[in-house]
């Protein structure tokens, strides 16, 4: 069914997400030691490293056109904190209408 | 045609349970495309969201900071219904409390509204 | 919480009228932002979405516009019917808050 071709789809984006940190962090000097907030997949999209002060925006990931194909793709903010990542905002639910592969409710 | 049918009390002490239910017709409380919302209104503080809840393979509740304290919703699957509970209730409580389900098209918006409840907390 | 203001609080208008009314976001809101028309005594009713978006069965003559903090709601040829209070609410982030209303009475 369409979940199981969309678990398909988030697994592929996973692996080229953690590609695409790998290739951020050689460009920005970055790592395991270094401040700021390492790159991320959280179980939707992709979040390029950041340094501390940053705000990151992503649209919400293309897959949500299958569940919503109306969906004029909103977007999500985090920001890097001292503290690390804070929260999506707004969450996934507001902001793209599913939130079926977000670890956090 | 979806409908909300409201039901419950129109008078509540001060420091009980205000108890309310929104019985579903039309659509199902386990839908996977809706959300079940609880709005209030006062003169004092116009139309005010107080919460939601929602099945995407489980439960999910979000709700007011201003009543986080004291609200439970809770479906209840066997009647396609879910409820409304707010504990500690002050004459501040009184409104019309409306039951809504949410639809997402773009962003959530609230397409069908139940009938409303007036509820008075008084001694 | 994102406050929701809006303006005039009351209008008062005549049949055939077109009047706009204003609502504005505290923060950007992108066009996460809904219009309901409420009448004496009766729940509100969704007229438009997603700021611009017509809810079916609405007539034509009810428009939006706006993204970011500031938002119209038109009504082209103002009938009989119209004459209500009017409520923006933002979705872009709970809790989904409602502005004050704007009430539409009879000149």
């Known amino acids: 069914g369409s979940m199981a071709h969309s678990d398909g789809i988030f697994k592929k984006e996973q692996a080229m997400c953690l590609e695409k940190i790998q290739r951020a962090n050689e460009l920005m000097g970055f790592n395991d030691s270094s401040p700021g907030c390492p790159g991320m997949w959280d179980n939707i999209t992709c979040w390029k490293p950041a340094h501390v002060g940053e705000m990151v925006l992503v649209s919400c990931p293309e897959l949500f056109r299958i569940f919503n194909p109306d969906q004029d793709m909103g977007v999500v903010s985090r920001n890097c904190t001292e503290d690390g990542w804070s929260e999506p905002f707004p969450h996934y639910f507001d902001a793209c209408g599913f939130d079926e592969y977000e670890s956090e409710t | 045609q979806v409908q909300l049918q409201q039901s419950g009390p129109g008078l509540v002490k001060p420091s009980q349970t205000l108890s309310l239910t929104c019985a579903i017709s039309?659509?199902?409380?386990?839908?996977?495309?809706?959300?079940w919302n609880w709005i209030r209104q006062s003169p004092s503080r116009g139309l005010e969201w107080l919460g939601r809840t929602y099945y995407r393979s489980k439960w999910s509740n979000h709700y007011a900071v201003s009543v986080k304290s004291r609200i439970t919703i809770n479906p209840d699957t066997s009647k396609s219904q879910f409820s409304l509970q707010l504990n500690s209730v002050t004459p501040e409580d009184t409104a019309v409390y409306y039951c809504?389900?949410?639809?997402?098209?773009?962003?959530?918006?609230?397409?069908?509204w139940g009938q409303g409840t007036l509820v008075t907390v008084s001694s | 919480d994102i406050q929701m203001t809006q303006s005039p609080s009351s209008l008062s208008a005549s049949v055939g009228d077109r009047i706009t009314i204003t609502c504005r976001a505290s923060q950007s809101i992108s066009r996460y932002l809904n219009w309901y028309q409420q009448k004496p005594g009766k729940a509100p009713k969704l007229l438009i979405y997603a700021a611009s978006s017509l809810q079916s069965g609405i007539p034509s003559r009810f428009s939006g516009s706006g993204s970011g903090t500031d938002f119209t709601l038109t009504i082209n040829s103002l009938q009989p019917e119209d004459f209500a209070t009017y409520f923006c609410?933002?979705?872009?982030?709970?809790?989904?808050?409602f502005g004050p209303g704007t009430k539409v009475d009879i000149k």
């Open positions: 039309g659509d199902s409380v386990s839908s996977n495309s809706a959300t």
């Open positions: 609410q933002q979705s872009y982030s709970p809790p989904f808050t």
């Open positions: 809504a389900r949410g639809t997402w098209k773009q962003l959530w918006f609230l397409d069908h």
